[in-house]
Interface confidence: medium
């Protein structure tokens, strides 16, 4: 088999024509990166290499996932004689997968004379640019259209060597050099019309498997020169063995013990140590909506519940900044945890002419909606006049008090004349330090809060000179009737510390939608949760008794075992191949005949959709 089982992978570069150091340094870097490398994960960039250097170490390279750039070198030949595929996952100058430019020395005889890419039979994406290589021969004798997968692309080849020897007579006009060993192997333009990819001969039965790239030695997926998608232990496959397979006993997708991960174009049992698993791929770092976790010794990317954790430096003592202001507000975007403190001072909000800091745009305070924890203190001494609460901190759960303000305060709110309620609806703990809330002349509701539940000691509270409790009650600034006796942070059912009856997504409600309403719910404790979308709404009765698709009273579409499903399994990967089922008259999913390969409408062989397998061959699995 041409396709090997284990392959040495190395990282490519993304420097373009920029180089650092002299020619010797360039060579050493190149040698260090590509010695014994078979697959370049990225781009292969060879720039400004001298004619005296030995580049034979490049001959192990069989595949480049990005682009190849050969520019301003003066060696005579490129020893990439085993290169089979350029994948073109990245392009040079936006459209080229192979870019060869200015490989000659105008003041000497040294120059690139031959590309030597004799085994290159596939460029999966991107075009070819080979220009201004004064002595480079046999680039216009290559049938680039046979190599480039994209038929719309025109190769850009010109202004190269002029005094070139013809191809050897045995090559039929297509070659990489003058000798009989330099003939170009055509694997696409010579194929029979029946072949929808490449071929290993002209006959209709000499087509390569559709998963091959670059050609093949025979018809099987193990006969490929290289793989179009993924190489799984020598076989070219459209996908690596997936992390989940269908269990016919539990009617659920379960972890596949034989799962493999995509590492470039190779399926591997485990990712290299500096990579993490994202779904079924090895990646250098998790995407922005996921975070790295370790499960059973495996580093994986998991979707974050909401925003991914992000810790940011705060203000005040030990920080670069005395206060949140217009010069630093943008550094708090997407922060979930403040390491240290947050100070809101008049010099931050109104600006500080002495430090040449302009006034803060109050809208920007909304960046703090993502903050869930402050490890130090929260100190609010100035707040925009039109903002009547601190609802930008509505997701703040914990004030740690690891560093304290002034005489031991972890929460200090003073002299905010326009604030009428605190609005700290998620605050559940002030771990250490004292609470000081004074001289906020319009501030109500804070008398209702059971501070003892948040703070450690009653003596740690200094709450005075705010709007008198009696005045607040006269003005109707009291907790919503749906709040419990624990109090509230402000008006309405969303500001309660806890609920008298039930709560739905943080808002207190009289009751969950058990038997009526557009969306039906069940209760876990006093919290309302929606039934699974695959549950059918039961009029005047209970729709579900839990969150799963197996807790529905009735199914909205179909039932597969105990689970309500949108459609019956169609080609879902099982232990022994794809699984197909059909819905019976009572909308239960039933297995197709074992020889059906594309689904069915009933249990019999004649109910199969498309072609059924002949009786002897039984690849797909049905249950």
């Amino acid at each position: 088999s041409e396709v090997g089982n284990s392959q040495a992978v190395c990282a490519g570069t993304l420097n373009g024509l920029s180089v650092t150091g002299d020619a010797q340094h360039q060579y050493r870097t190149l040698h260090k990166m590509y010695n014994n490398c078979e697959i370049v994960m990225g781009n292969l960039e060879i720039v400004l290499i001298d004619h005296t250097q030995d580049l034979s170490f490049l001959q192990t390279i069989r595949e480049v996932t990005g682009y190849i750039l050969i520019a301003m070198n003066v060696f005579s030949t490129l020893p990439l004689r085993n290169l089979r595929v350029i994948r073109g996952t990245q392009f040079y100058e936006e459209k080229y997968a192979l870019f060869v430019l200015l490989n000659y020395n105008p003041n000497a005889t040294h120059a690139l004379r031959q590309l030597g890419l004799n085994r290159l039979t596939e460029i999966l994406a991107g075009g070819v640019y080979i220009e201004k290589n004064e002595q480079l021969c046999h680039v216009d004798t290559v049938e680039w259209r046979d190599i480039m997968r994209d038929p719309r692309l025109e190769p850009v080849v010109g202004d190269n060597g002029r005094a070139c020897a013809p191809c050897h007579e045995s090559c039929g006009g297509h070659c990489w050099g003058p000798g009989p060993e330099d003939c170009q192997q055509l694997t696409k333009t010579i194929c029979a019309p029946q072949c929808n990819g490449r071929c290993f001969g002209r006959a209709p039965n000499e087509c390569c498997h559709e998963e091959c790239a670059g050609g093949c030695t025979g018809p099987l997926q193990t006969h490929c020169f290289a793989c179009r998608h993924f190489n799984d232990s020598g076989a070219c496959v459209p996908l690596c063995p997936q992390p989940l397979i269908y269990n016919k006993l539990t009617f659920q997708l379960e972890p596949n013990p034989d799962t493999k991960y995509q590492y470039g174009s190779v399926c591997v049992r485990s990712c290299p140590h500096n990579f993490v698993v994202d779904q079924s791929s090895c990646v250098r770092a998790c995407p922005s909506n996921k975070m790295e976790v370790e499960k059973n010794g495996l580093k994986m990317c998991e979707p974050c519940a909401g925003l991914c954790p992000k810790a940011c430096e705060g203000t005040g003592a030990g920080s670069h900044y005395q206060t949140v202001d217009s010069s630093n507000i943008d550094s708090f975007v997407n922060c979930t945890k403040i390491l240290g403190n947050l100070d809101f001072l008049i010099t931050g909000l109104e600006g500080d002419p002495w430090r040449n800091i302009s006034a803060l745009d109050p809208e920007k305070l909304n960046v703090f909606r993502t903050v869930r924890e402050i490890t130090g203190y929260l100190n609010i001494q100035s707040w925009p006049k039109h903002m009547h609460n601190f609802s930008v901190f509505s997701n703040l759960e914990t004030i740690g008090g690891r560093s304290l303000y002034n005489r031991g305060f972890s929460l200090l709110i003073m002299k905010n004349d326009n604030v009428t309620s605190l609005g700290l609806r998620s605050l559940r703990e002030v771990s250490a330090g004292r609470v000081y809330i004074t001289e906020n002349r319009r501030l109500c509701y804070l008398h209702t809060v059971q501070w003892a539940a948040l703070s450690r000691r009653r003596a740690d509270l200094d709450i005075r000179n705010n709007k008198p409790r009696g005045k607040c009650q006269q003005e109707g600034k009291v907790c919503d009737p749906l709040c419990s006796a624990d109090g509230c942070w402000g008006p309405g059912p969303a500001q309660c510390l806890s609920c008298r009856h039930y709560s739905r997504r943080g808002v207190c409600v009289e009751s969950c939608s058990f038997t009526q309403g557009e969306t039906r719910e069940f209760a876990e404790g006093t919290e309302c949760f929606e039934c699974h979308p695959e549950c059918e709404r039961v009029e005047g009765g209970i729709t579900c008794n839990g969150s799963g698709a197996d807790t529905c009273t009735r199914c909205a579409h179909y039932r597969d075992g105990p689970h309500c499903v949108e459609r019956c399994p169609e080609g879902i990967l099982g232990e022994r191949g794809p699984i197909y089922k059909y819905p019976d008259s009572s909308r239960e999913c039933r297995p197709c005949h074992e020889n059906c390969t594309r689904g069915c409408t009933g249990p019999l062989l004649q109910d199969c959709l498309g072609d059924a397998l002949p009786s002897a061959r039984r690849a797909p699995t049905v249950i």
């Epitope: 005395q322 002495w354 100035s382 303000y405 002034n406 005489r407 002299k415 004074t438 001289e439």
Partner: nanobody
């Protein structure tokens, strides 16, 4: 920083009066409060009185309530401490202090970031 200069200290008989002044200059546009503290011989510095610069709210130590009065003149950036019915135990160096951002509660020494040099008040019996 705010620069502070005190004046008005001196020697006075018990039961007598003195008026201390403290003039602020420099970065006074963000003043929060100005206060008076004192430090008797061999004692810690202690709070005497303070006045909120924006609304004139006043705070006094229990030991001086009813005898001392703090006032301010915003136009002159000056704070005054009128001391009546002085007692020998009022003998101390009196310091003027200013609280600029970040502000703190008026009665706490930690809230003040600018201090005068101090003026000596001696009450003889």
């Amino acid at each position: 920083e705010v620069q502070l200069v005190e004046s008005g200290g001196g020697l006075v008989q018990a039961g007598g009066s003195l008026r201390l002044s403290c003039a602020a200059s420099g970065r006074t546009y963000y003043l929060n409060a100005m206060g008076w503290f004192r430090q008797g011989p061999g004692k810690d510095r202690e709070f005497v009185a303070a006045i909120d610069w924006s609304d004139g709210n006043k705070d006094y130590a229990d030991s001086v309530k009813g005898r001392f009065t703090i006032s301010r003149d915003n136009a002159k950036n000056t704070v005054y401490l009128q001391m009546n019915s002085l007692k020998p135990e009022d003998t101390a160096v009196y310091y003027c202090a200013a609280d600029t951002p970040p502000w703190g509660p008026m009665i706490y020494i930690e809230s003040y970031d600018s201090w005068g040099q101090g003026t000596q008040v001696t009450v003889s019996s």
